[in-house]
C-alpha cells in the first residue's frame, strides 16, 4: 500500500505589475499531476509582510492571486497542494511548501523618504496629501507621487503638485471616479544629483480619511417653556445625511458648557428661565455606517441668542 | 441516512460563552470537510468557519476570527464550535454542514435543523 | 474577498411560470457555484452544484447554468413547492466562502 505524495506547485512567484503595492501571486500545477486527472485540486496559499506575526492563509482554486502590501517591507508567501480524499480514495494529502520572497531594492538612507505624510480626504470630494522633505535632504532633491487604485489601467503621476522653496510638499489630485471602498495605493519617490533618495509607499481607503464641510443653517425653536431645539443642516456636497455624527458644544450665560454627539441634525436642550445667552457650535463627521474612520469637520460659525426674549420666542439668527 | 444534529444554543450574556456541538452520521464522518454557516433573524447566510477532514485545517470568516474554534473529534464524529466573547450581532440560527467536496469548504450538502444562539443582556 | 450579488431580492410569479435567478460574482469563480433553497423555519437544500450539476435527489425542472461572473438558476416550470428564498454560494477562493443575499420567490 503506497503512500500517495503530490508535489507543490511549480513556478511559484510573486509579481509586480506596477500598482505600488497590488501585487499577483502566481504558479503552475504541480508535476505529475496525471494520477489525479479527475481530481480537482486546490492550493493553500499563505502570505504576509516580512515582520508581520500573522499569515493571511487563502485556498483557491485558481493558478493565481492578487492582494495589497506594503512595499516598504518585503513580502514573503508559501504555497502547498490539497488534494481532498476523494482524489486519493483514502485520507486527505498536502504537498510540501514552495516558498517566495518579493521586495523592492531600498535606494537611499530612510531619513531621505518623505516625513509626516498626511491625505484628506475633503468632503468626500478632493483629495490633498501634503508631507515635509526628507531630513537633510538638499534643495535640489524633489519628491514625485504616484496613486493607483482598482479600476486605472496604470499608475499615474499626481499633475497638481503643491510645492514650497521650488520642491513639491504636496499633491491636489484630481477627480477621482469611482474610487472609495477600495484600496487606494501612494508611492512618493525622489531624485537629487547628490543622494538617492528612498520611496515610501501609503496605502488607505478614501472613505476613512473624509474630512467634511461644517454643518451650516443653524437655527433655535422654543418646544417648551423649559427646552430648546437646536437644528441644522448638513453640509452641502455629496455626503449623504445617513453618513454623518455630530458634536455639539453649547454655552450657556459664557459659563455652562455642555458637549454631546448625536446621530441626527438636531438636539433639544433644557433650560431654565434664568438662561439670559444660548450659543451653540457643530461640527460633522462621517459615521461607523460609511466609514471606518474619519475626521472631524471645523466647527460651524457660532449661533447666539442674546436677550430676554430668549423664554418666549422661537428663535432665529 | 446522512444525519447533523446541532446542539448547544442558548441564551447568553454579551462577552459570554457557548459551545455548539454537531452529531453527524450516516457518512465516513472523517473524511469530509465540515463547516459551519450561521442566519441572523430575517437574513440571509453567512458563513463562519469550515475544517478539513483528517488533517483538521481550519479556517474562519474575519467577523469571528480569534474569537470562535471549530474543531473535530473524528473518533466520535462530532463537529464543534467554541464561541467565546460573544456579542450582540452573532445573535442567530447556527447550522453544521457537510462539505460535498473540497479540502475545508465547497457546496454543502447536507445540513443540520440548526441551533439558536442568543446574544442578549 | 468575492462579492456574490443576487437579482432580483424578491420575484413574483405564478405556478407553472418559467423562473430565473441571477447571481454575479465580483471576480471570475470558474464554474464553483452552487444554488440553495431555504423554507421558513428550515435548513438550506442543495439544488446545484458547480454551477450545472444537479443534486441527486432535486427536480429536473431545476437547472444551472453560466460560469466566470454570471450565474444563473432556472425552474422551468414552477410548483406550489417552489415558493422559497434561493440563494447562490461560490467555493472558488475562501475564506471566506460567500453567499448571495437571497432571493424570495412569492405567489404572485
Known amino acids: 500500500d503506497t503512500e500517495i505524495k503530490v508535489n507543490p506547485p511549480q513556478d511559484f512567484e510573486i509579481v509586480d505589475p506596477g500598482y505600488l503595492g497590488y501585487l499577483y501571486l502566481q504558479w503552475q500545477p504541480p508535476l505529475s499531476l496525471d494520477h489525479f486527472k479527475e481530481c480537482t485540486v486546490e492550493y493553500e496559499l499563505k502570505y504576509r509582510n516580512i515582520g508581520s506575526e500573522t499569515w493571511k492563509t487563502i485556498i483557491t482554486k485558481n493558478l493565481h492571486y492578487k492582494d495589497g502590501f506594503d512595499l516598504n517591507k518585503g513580502i514573503e508567501a508559501k504555497i502547498h497542494t490539497l488534494l481532498p480524499w476523494q482524489c486519493t480514495n483514502g485520507s486527505e494529502v498536502q504537498s510540501s511548501w514552495a516558498e517566495t520572497t518579493y521586495w523592492i531594492s531600498p535606494q537611499g538612507i530612510p531619513e531621505t523618504k518623505v516625513q509626516d505624510m498626511d491625505c484628506v480626504y475633503y468632503n468626500w470630494q478632493y483629495l490633498l496629501c501634503s508631507w515635509k522633505p526628507g531630513i537633510g535632504v538638499l534643495l535640489d532633491t524633489n519628491y514625485n507621487l504616484f496613486y493607483w487604485y482598482e479600476g486605472l489601467d496604470h499608475a499615474l503621476q499626481c499633475v497638481d503638485y503643491i510645492k514650497a522653496d521650488g520642491q513639491n510638499i504636496g499633491c491636489r489630485f484630481p477627480y477621482l471616479e469611482a474610487s472609495d471602498y477600495k484600496d487606494f495605493y501612494i508611492c512618493v519617490n525622489g531624485s537629487s544629483e547628490n543622494k538617492p533618495i528612498r520611496s515610501s509607499y501609503f496605502t488607505f481607503q478614501l472613505q476613512n480619511i473624509v474630512k467634511p464641510l461644517p454643518p451650516v443653517y443653524l437655527t433655535f425653536t422654543r418646544e417648551s417653556s423649559c427646552e430648546i431645539k437646536l437644528k441644522w443642516s448638513i453640509p452641502l456636497g455629496p455626503i449623504p445625511a445617513r453618513c454623518f455624527d455630530y458634536e455639539i458644544e453649547i454655552r450657556e450665560d459664557d459659563t455652562t458648557l455642555v458637549t454631546a454627539t448625536v446621530e441626527n441634525e438636531t438636539y433639544t436642550l433644557k433650560t431654565t428661565n434664568e438662561t439670559r445667552q444660548l450659543c451653540f457650535v457643530v461640527r460633522s463627521k462621517v459615521n461607523i455606517y460609511c466609514s471606518d474612520d474619519g475626521i472631524w469637520s471645523e466647527w460651524s460659525d457660532k449661533q447666539c441668542w442674546e436677550g430676554e426674549d430668549l423664554s418666549k420666542k422661537t428663535l432665529l439668527r | 441516512e446522512v444525519q447533523l444534529l446541532e446542539s448547544g444554543g442558548g441564551l447568553v450574556q454579551p462577552g459570554g460563552s457557548l459551545r455548539l456541538s454537531c452529531a453527524a452520521s450516516g457518512f465516513t464522518f472523517r473524511k469530509y470537510a465540515m463547516g459551519w454557516v450561521r442566519q441572523a433573524p430575517g437574513k440571509g447566510l453567512e458563513w463562519v468557519s469550515g475544517?478539513?477532514?483528517?488533517?483538521?485545517?481550519?479556517y474562519y470568516a474575519d467577523s469571528v476570527k480569534g474569537r470562535f474554534t471549530i474543531s473535530r473529534d473524528n473518533s466520535k464524529n462530532t463537529l464543534y464550535l467554541q464561541m467565546n466573547s460573544l456579542r450582540a450581532e452573532d445573535t442567530a440560527v447556527y447550522y453544521c454542514?457537510?462539505?460535498?467536496?473540497?479540502w475545508g469548504a465547497g457546496a454543502f450538502d447536507y445540513w443540520g435543523q440548526g441551533t439558536l444562539v442568543t446574544v442578549s443582556s | 474577498d468575492i462579492q456574490m450579488t443576487q437579482s432580483p431580492s424578491t420575484l413574483s410569479a405564478s405556478v407553472g411560470d418559467r423562473v430565473t435567478i441571477t447571481c454575479r460574482a465580483s471576480?471570475?469563480?470558474?464554474?464553483?457555484l452552487a444554488w440553495y433553497q431555504q423554507k421558513p423555519g428550515k435548513a438550506p437544500k442543495l439544488l446545484i452544484y458547480?454551477?450545472?450539476s444537479l443534486e441527486s435527489g432535486v427536480p429536473s425542472r431545476f437547472s444551472g447554468s453560466g460560469s466566470g461572473t454570471e450565474f444563473t438558476l432556472t425552474i422551468s416550470s414552477l410548483q406550489p413547492d417552489d415558493f422559497a428564498t434561493y440563494y447562490c454560494q461560490q467555493y472558488d477562493t475562501y475564506p471566506p466562502i460567500t453567499f448571495g443575499q437571497g432571493t424570495k420567490v412569492e405567489i404572485k
Open positions: 471576480q471570475s469563480i470558474s464554474s464553483w
Open positions: 454542514a457537510k462539505v460535498r467536496y473540497g
Open positions: 458547480d454551477a450545472s
Open positions: 475544517i478539513s477532514g483528517s488533517v483538521g485545517s481550519t
